[in-house]
Interface confidence: low
Amino acid sequence: MAVTACQGLGFVVSLIGIAGIIAATCMDQWSTQDLYNNPVTAVFNYQGLWRSCVRESSGFTECRGYFTLLGLPAMLQAVRALMIVGIVLGAIGLLVSIFALKCIRIGSMEDSAKANMTLTSGIMFIVSGLCAIAGVSVFANMLVTNFWMSTANMYTGMGGMVQTVQTRYTFGAALFVGWVAGGLTLIGGVMMCIACRGLAPEETNYKAVSYHASGHSVAYKPGGFKASTGFGSNTKNKKIYDGGARTEDEVQSYPSKHDYV
């Protein structure tokens, strides 16, 4: 039950995270004009990864896409790439994780296959989240750099020199959405990886069977069977005792005719 809950919760958290990453990528308010030092009160500028917008005091807003790559910082292109990679990986991860969900039955898919798919989707979510966090952080760093550059430029460029002065920009709402969404996707991925360990039967536990043979009292307790999934190890072939209460996610094997060889 715990594994199913962990897997389901991981899926939902990742789904919300990826939706957030998509929203952040599409949002226009990645950076907004710093109103504290705004030389123009009539116009408020803000921009995203794909277009730039101007909102007037009247409420009229007009947005214009970046139709050319010329003049756009290389870092902005890198941020775009990171966000797109994050979305693509996240989308693939979601697709894989749907089929990996324990509550969904697809043919005669074994638990080991579901475990592998859960792990794959988990890793994809982790990488997706990291891509989003990295993209937003690179953009934020670029803004901070430009913020201080602009402040410095205000006091330079005298003596007839041609000087481009940049207005200050500060963090937009999309940055915070991106950070939170990336974090959620990352957490969801970790939860999927944790759920994967519970899905993969590391050892098949047999109930102890007592029987008499030739007048001698023998308690037969088979050693742990190592699953070929590659998760964990049981090198010491330790004895496994029945702990009593078990969850529905644990493998429960009962004695069969093969136990009485």
Partner: nanobody
Framework: EVQLVESGGGLVQPGGSLRLSCAAS????????MGWFRQAPGKGRELVSR???????NYADSVKGRFTISRDNSKNTLYLQMNSLRAEDTAVYYC????????WGQGTLVTVSS
């Protein structure tokens, strides 16, 4: 690299005309917001006129009917035609472009005096 270079400023008598030019490089003037701002001695910077990428134009109330903003896409240049100049129009005029960030030229001085 994005750069803006203004020209056309100078001394002019009240009622006279001037045409300011702003040569842009690093982007196309038709694909972004561009505008003219001015800063009179001891005063803050104010918006004179703005032209959006789509062609929408705005003017400050004080210059409506006297100033005309335009752009030449082939020359990648923004213009400000100033007619019926007054003494209060004396200021440093800045060309500005909003292309992912705000970019400003170095400014050109316009003096209206008799």
């Amino acid at each position: 690299e994005v750069q803006l270079v203004e020209s056309g400023g100078g001394l002019v008598q009240p009622g006279g005309s001037l045409r300011l030019s702003c040569a842009a490089s690093g982007f196309t003037v038709s694909s972004t917001y561009m505008g003219w701002f001015r800063q009179a001695p001891g005063k803050g910077r104010e918006l004179v006129s703005r032209i959006a990428g789509g062609g929408q134009i705005n003017y400050a109330d004080s210059v409506k009917g006297r100033f005309t903003i335009s752009r030449d896409n082939s020359k990648n240049t923004l213009y400000l035609q100033m007619n019926s100049l007054r003494a209060e129009d004396t200021a440093v005029y800045y060309c500005a472009a909003h292309y992912w960030m705000d970019y400003w030229g170095q400014g050109t001085l316009v003096t209206v005096s008799s």
